[in-house]
Interface confidence: low
């Protein structure tokens, strides 16, 4: 267990031309706050995917009012660190998203009270217990300077916070085979309490006798790499011989979500939907009030004046979840009919209809044949939103106005010659072939392959196509 800590040093215009306009104005003051989202591994997942390692919000910064005519300076920042507690081992490699949010203190009819000003993301390697790492990230014309570190919570130590340290039992030295816990020389590494044989690289334990696997490893001793390429079952534990996932207990078995959270399986792990007042990977973090700004995406926080009273996030259209953190994919319900393209504009759904369809959900089939005539005895056929003429023999084109050349498509097989005829076409077959399109070979003994030549026609005679 441990804590990831993020310190924002500055947020302001980046170097170079095109300095951004201040996000706050004289008549619409605003203040900034930050959100950090952590994911294990070097994943390149979408910004909306769960923050599996955890997430945190900063306090609100001081209210800032732009001085008219002045360029945007570095903006006043919230006090303190952003802290993301992690319960399991620190993964060593992680992805981060840091969002800079603007809280507008002015009226915004037709818009939210909060808006995302900048989002930076990156993938880093970081050992727990190490020094602060400094970073600079740019998002458009903005520049964010920050530092971060991961530290273990006692008694955990080590680069993954998986080793345990205990105070020395003897004043002079540690027990047999046990090292001092640098840099805490007055403490000793605790005896290994994991299940015997548990992989020291890929497994860890928090309780005596257990063996819990880091991401990407499975098996009772965490010695089997997860490989789902040839597997049908979506979950483990794995078969030690193939490394293939076979049916077994799922990630939600035993409900890892605390404080009444409900668990749902995801392709790689699980996700907790937390009740109000709790958040974190396993709903383990509590004491959140509206002052902490727990509602994302313009959600309105009510109640929750003190840590003992729950807050409620009222989400704007297009977002859901106890903290408005989930974007509603309203197009997944496929509301547009007849092949229309669904567009989720946030405040509304729009359907872009295919030709021949109309209406808010493309539900109206326009009468394609209305007012349209097919020439030369053709008949109009509606279908797929496009008017189409089924033309009489000898005519073609959109409206059957063109004389068709029945031989244009080379319909006579095996070298047969095509002749246009008043009622269609006639194929004169090459020796050895017969049929309306010269498609049937004639057997050497003179008997034809099925179908038999009609009476009165010798093999090789032109076959008239009726």
């Amino acid at each position: 267990a441990g804590v990831f800590e993020l310190q924002i040093h500055s947020f302001g215009p980046g170097p170079g031309p095109g300095a951004p306009r201040s996000p706050c104005s004289a008549r619409l003051p605003c203040r900034l706050f930050f959100r950090v989202c952590l994911k294990p591994g070097l994943s390149e997942e979408a910004a909306e995917s769960p923050c599996a390692l955890g997430a945190a919000l900063s306090a609100r910064g001081p209210v800032y009012t732009e001085q008219p005519g002045a360029p945007a300076p570095d903006l006043p920042l919230p006090d303190g660190l952003l802290q993301v507690p992690f319960r399991d081992a620190w993964p060593g490699t992680f992805s981060f998203i840091i969002e800079t949010w603007r809280e507008e203190l002015g009226d915004q009819i037709g818009g939210p009270a909060w808006s995302l000003l900048a989002r930076v993301a990156g993938r880093r390697r970081l050992a727990a217990g190490g020094p602060w790492a400094r970073d600079i990230q740019r998002a458009g014309a903005w520049e964010l300077r920050f530092s971060y570190r991961a530290r273990c919570e006692p008694p955990a130590v080590g680069t993954a916070c998986t080793r345990l340290c205990r105070p020395r039992s003897a004043p002079s030295r540690c027990g047999p085979g046990l090292r001092p816990c640098a840099p805490l020389e007055d403490e000793c590494e605790a005896p290994l309490v994991c299940r015997a044989g548990c992989s020291p690289e890929h497994g860890f334990c928090e309780q005596p006798g257990e063996c819990r696997c880091l991401e990407g490893w499975t098996g009772p001793l965490c010695t089997v790499p997860v490989s789902t390429s040839s597997c049908l079952s979506p979950r483990g534990p794995s078969s030690a011989t193939t490394g293939c996932l076979v049916p077994g207990p799922g990630p939600c078995d035993g409900n890892p979500c605390a404080n009444g959270g409900s668990c749902s399986e995801t392709p790689r792990s699980f996700e907790c939907t937390c009740p109000r007042g709790f958040y974190g990977l396993r709903c383990e973090v509590s004491g959140v009030t509206c002052a902490d700004g727990p509602c994302f995406n313009g959600g309105l926080c009510v109640g929750g004046a003190d840590p003992d009273s729950a807050y409620i996030c009222h989400c704007p259209p297009g977002f859901q979840g106890s903290n408005c953190e989930k974007r509603v994919d309203r197009c997944s319900l496929q509301p547009c009919r007849n092949g229309g393209l669904c567009l989720d504009l946030g405040h509304a759904l729009r359907c872009r209809c295919r030709a021949g369809f109309a209406g808010p959900r493309c539900e109206h089939d326009l009468d394609d044949c209305a007012g349209r005539a097919c020439a030369n005895g053709g008949t109009c056929v509606e279908g797929g939103g496009a008017h189409r003429c089924s033309c009489a023999l000898g005519f073609g084109g959109r409206d059957c106005r063109e004389r068709a050349d029945p031989c244009a498509a080379r319909p006579c097989a095996h070298g047969g010659r095509c002749y246009a005829h008043f009622s269609g076409l006639v194929c004169a077959c090459a020796p050895g072939y017969m049929g309306a399109r010269c498609e049937f070979p004639v057997h050497p003994d003179g008997a034809s392959a099925l179908p038999a030549a009609p009476p009165g026609l010798r093999p090789g005679d032109p076959q008239r196509y009726l």
Epitope: S25, R27, L105, G106, D107, Q108, I109, V302, G303
Partner: antibody, heavy 118, light 107 residues
């Protein structure tokens, strides 16, 4: 000094339409939303709707949809409210109010008295 | 729609007295409540926004408090110029709604 100057009193016949104006000065017009409020019989206030001059966003009270139309002219920093199909129920004082903080009306016009009578 | 209920409808006070006006919302509106003062033949004026924030230039004898559904406007020591109607309004959700008002009269 911020000022919201409304057009003068109106006496109109039932069934007619009227357009009330609210000319602003002393602040950047596009940085504050403009709301309209009806006050009947000198007592309760009724919100008609609001418009954001910056992005054109409009919100109406359901009760006044079809009755009121809100528009702005950014070039003259003026907001307008048109009321149509007037009846005696529409006789009231109408105020425009700008909101600096979120939907709190920090400045109000002096009010326009509308009388609908045959 | 959210209904804002003010009480009492009217009250008569003497100069120097402490006055408490009440406003109740039919559902939780957080702290999105404002108070307006309207003197006879004048337009309303903003006194309090965000339930408890005193607007610029408003005397400190006016205090707003409350959250969720119960809100109060307190005048610690009533002055003659405070004779007016007082309206509360919510801006938690559209449509914005106001209470029916409380008329403050002087004895």
């Amino acid at each position: 000094e911020v000022q919201l100057q409304q057009s003068g009193p109106e006496l109109v016949k039932p069934g007619a339409s009227v357009k009330i104006s609210c000319k602003t000065s002393g602040y950047t017009f596009t940085e504050s939303a403009m709301h309209w409020v009806k006050q009947s019989h000198g007592k309760s206030l009724e919100w008609i709707g609001g418009i954001n001059p910056n992005n054109g966003g409009i919100s109406y009270s359901q009760k006044f949809k079809g009755k009121a139309t809100l528009t702005v002219d950014k070039s003259s920093s003026t907001a307008y409210m048109e009321l149509r199909s007037l009846t005696s129920e529409d006789s009231a004082v109408y105020y425009c109010g700008s909101s600096y903080y979120r939907d709190y009306f920090d400045y109000w016009g002096q009010g326009t008295t509308l009388t609908v009578s045959s | 729609n959210i209904v804002m209920t003010q009480s009492p409808e009217s009250m008569s006070m003497s100069v120097g007295e402490r006055v408490t006006l009440s406003c109740k919302a039919s559902e939780n509106v957080g702290t999105y409540v404002s108070w307006y003062q309207q003197k006879p033949d004048q337009s309303p004026k903003l006194l309090i926004y965000g339930a408890s924030n005193r607007y610029t230039g408003v005397p400190d004898r006016f205090t707003g408090s409350g959250s969720a559904t119960h809100f109060t406007l307190t005048i610690s020591s009533v002055q003659a110029e405070d004779l007016a109607d007082y309206h509360c309004g919510q801006s938690y959700s559209y449509p914005l709604t106001f209470g029916a008002g409380t008329k403050l009269e002087l004895k």
